[in-house]
């Protein structure tokens, strides 16, 4: 749908020209769809640049979904022969350097840096702690090394690439992409509740991965971590689905999905199993 199309920016292998439009679905997030089946499928993960497994609910979703690992690789990874790995002095910036700064949908705001393609400089912004894009660096130096030009108009540092033997995809070596997900659910769902640094007593919910439930806690109003939700429903939506559960017998169950685009403060966007 149009909302889906609007939401995704094409991000491609570091050393390759942008993907042709026919392959833009490779940049889509893994979308399990609103149904409740448990079907093993594969999607291309733009962050790890690999085809990975995810659980598909059985209806809707998007085109970044393949029956087999081979089919995914065929559609979304490039042949070694088509790759031109340039030397340091010839390198162009990775495509993600040109993406707009993206705070993501969470609200555990932390300082990060992005490359501003207008000013040609790395600049500070506030990242919400989850999702977002790869134009997001923990340090100013890291951002400069990867995205800024050196004095001769060349890259400051070698944006190293390594051919991944498993799936023939290029894996960037220099950048620390925020580790957004681990296991079957978002990694922040595994962190303990963190009150933070201030003195307020706001009612929030966190996901308790030991008992597998969302529990209330008092948030101080600043600091803390991303395992912090304004409602139990939001907490469950983000964390519960990542931990695969058995479903009752019967047909596919459709659930209504709220999609609130782009507003950082309201985290209603669906968080999917595995990487986005």
């Amino acid at each position: 749908d149009s909302e889906e199309d609007e939401e995704h920016t094409i991000i491609t292998d570091t050393e390759l020209p942008p993907l042709k439009l026919m392959h833009s679905f490779c940049a889509f997030k893994a979308d399990d769809g609103p149904c409740k089946a448990i079907m093993k499928r594969f999607f291309f993960n733009i962050f790890t640049r690999q085809c990975e497994e995810f659980i598909y609910g059985g209806c809707e979703g998007n085109q970044n979904r393949f029956e087999s690992l081979e089919e995914c690789k065929k559609m979304c990874t490039r042949d070694n022969a088509n790759r031109i790995i340039k030397t340091t002095l010839q390198q162009e910036k990775p495509d993600f350097c040109f993406l707009e700064e993206d705070p993501g949908i969470c609200r555990g705001y932390i300082t990060r840096y992005f490359y501003n393609n207008q000013t040609k400089q790395c600049e500070r912004f506030k990242y919400g702690g989850c999702l977002g894009n790869m134009n997001n660096f923990e340090t100013l130096e890291e951002c400069k090394n990867i995205c800024e030009d050196g004095p001769n108009g060349f890259q400051v540092d070698n944006y190293g690439t390594q051919l991944n033997a498993v799936n023939n995809s290029l894996t960037p070596q220099s950048t620390k992409v925020p580790s957004l997900f681990e296991f079957h659910g978002p990694s922040w769902c595994l962190t303990p509740a963190d009150r933070g640094l201030c003195r307020a007593n706001e009612n929030r919910f966190y996901y308790n991965s030991v008992i597998g439930k969302c529990r209330p806690f008092k948030y101080s109003g600043c600091g803390g971590n991303e395992n912090n939700f304004t409602s139990k429903q939001e907490c469950l939506r983000a964390c519960k689905k990542g931990f695969i559960q058995r479903i009752s017998k019967g047909g596919l169950i459709k659930t209504k999905r709220k999609r609130k685009k782009q507003r950082v403060k309201i985290a209603y966007e669906e968080i999917f199993v595995k990487n986005m």
């Epitope: 300082t111 207008q118 600043c222």
Partner: antibody, heavy 118, light 112 residues
Amino acid sequence: EVQLVESGGGLVKPGGSLRLSCAASGFTFSSYAMNWVRQAPGKGLEWVGTITTGGSYTYYADSVDGRFTISRDNAKNSLYLQMNSLRAEDTAVYYCARQDGNFLMDYWGQGTLVTVSS
Amino acid sequence: DVVMTQTPLSLPVTLGQPASISCKSSPSLLDVDGKTYLNWLQQRPGQSPKRLIYLVSKLDSGVPDRFTGSGSGTDFTLKISRVEAEDVGVYYCWQGTHFPFTFGQGTKVEIK
């Protein structure tokens, strides 16, 4: 010279709507994140929200979240604040402010007064 | 949200004499990148705010060097070495370390 000029303020009834504009000149508008900050009569300053350089993403203060929407038109060097479901406590002078590379506000406009009263 | 507390709220000063404004934050404004995003604004009567100082002590261009900012962690100070008539107005400290941005209540500087 950096210039930010707000407009669109006025008197509005509680529950009503208003759209503020901020015309930017003297710098490359699309290079900067932008903010709205307000100041109630005789009171201090309160940050309202921020919009990213390309306009795709916004941050909001809890007090206005869900009621106010910030947008921008980089082709027109303009920043906007759509205010819905206005309340008496939204009465303030609204300033637009530019965000520098440190994610700090550096230049401010002259402000436009919004009065919410029945 | 981070609380910014300014003292005094009113500061009557004699022309040519020094002035000092204190700003305290809770919690610390030292960010993960090692920088402290504490800033000072000046708002002259009937005018919009103007940035004076950012990152604790860096003066904005065009700001006279009689203004100095200092401090670290949670305690910050704005000093005017010799107050001039054009310095009358309200001074705000504000922080850009933690989100959302928060401001002090303001200190009104007036001539005795």
